[in-house]
Interface confidence: medium
């Protein structure tokens, strides 16, 4: 028979044959052959693999570094990574929660929708058209672009979500 060019779900193609992938929580030891099944081994104590895979090494569980204000929210298993969270009163800087801040700043291009309180973190929002923020701030809202017209000037450079418009003098040479 013709060697396969594609395999079923949870299989992979190697040496012109389809081998079973290792299940989550296990790593690949050896590929299948004509006569043997794929050989897999469970991940070690502080390791995991969260997909059907052909990885030869498991991933290390995330370390929740107390020096960064982190603690374990959910202990990892052979199939899942450890989930970190911040100490009481602190907030994660990102969804991955790799470090903690007392309250988060909104990056340039974003403004503060709601200032942090003792229990909730800063809420940021993207600056809409007509507004900008050029600073990283835990307090500042998006500012409206300068209105050149009210100063009897014209827009020389358009504004963005991170920059104000640049105004300049009217062109006096118009007929």
């Amino acid at each position: 028979p013709e060697p396969p060019t594609a395999c079923r779900e949870k299989q992979y193609l190697i040496n012109s044959q389809c081998c079973s992938l290792c299940q989550p929580g296990q790593k690949l030891v050896s590929d299948c052959t004509e006569f043997t099944e794929t050989e897999c081994l469970p991940c070690g104590e502080s390791e995991f693999l969260d997909t059907w895979n052909r990885e030869t090494h498991c991933h290390q569980h995330k370390y929740c570094d107390p020096n960064l204000g982190l603690r374990v929210q959910q202990k990892g298993t052979s199939e899942t990574d450890t989930i970190c969270t911040c100490e009481e009163g602190w907030h994660c800087t990102s969804e991955a929660c790799e470090s903690c801040v007392l309250h988060r700043s909104c990056s340039p291009g974003f403004g503060v929708k709601q200032i942090a309180t003792g229990v909730s973190d800063t809420i940021c929002e993207p600056c809409p058209v007509g507004f900008f923020s050029n600073v990283s701030s835990a307090f500042e809202k998006c500012h409206p672009w300068t209105s050149c017209e009210t100063k009897d000037l014209v827009v020389q450079q358009a504004g963005t979500n991170k920059t104000d418009v640049v105004c300049g003098p009217q062109d006096r040479l118009r007929a």
Epitope: E87, S99, C100, V101, L102, H103, S105, S137, F139, E140
Partner: nanobody
């Protein structure tokens, strides 16, 4: 290397005043929003006040609004906190901070004790 050095703490009677200073070095001071944060004995950190890089915008926790005033002198790379009408519950170590990350650019703090 970023350095923040707080001073001006001490023992004061309820109703009294103190002015804290924070001398900053190792970064372009006027580019950064600066903050005061405090930690009362046995309690967690509490944000107190912040000021924009240009000094025009100030922000306060409800617990200190109307009593404390934050200011800065960018020519001297110094942040200030004027504390009036002090209360026993203002007793804490006061830190100035450039960022509010855990162990991020904190000074060593200055102790303010309000007691009769």
């Amino acid at each position: 290397e970023v350095q923040l050095l707080e001073s001006g703490g001490g023992l004061v009677q309820p109703g009294g005043s103190l002015r804290l200073s924070c001398a900053a070095s190792g970064f372009t001071f006027e580019w950064y929003e600066m903050q005061w944060v405090r930690q009362a004995p046995g309690k967690g950190l509490e944000w107190v006040s912040a000021i924009s890089g240009d000094g025009y915008r100030t922000y306060y926790a409800d617990s200190v609004k109307g009593r404390f005033t934050i200011s800065r002198d960018n020519s001297k790379n110094t942040l200030y906190l004027q504390m009036n009408s002090l209360r026993a519950e203002d007793t804490a170590v006061y830190y100035c901070a450039k960022e509010l990350g855990y162990f991020d650019y904190w000074g060593q703090g200055t102790l303010v004790t309000v007691s009769s």
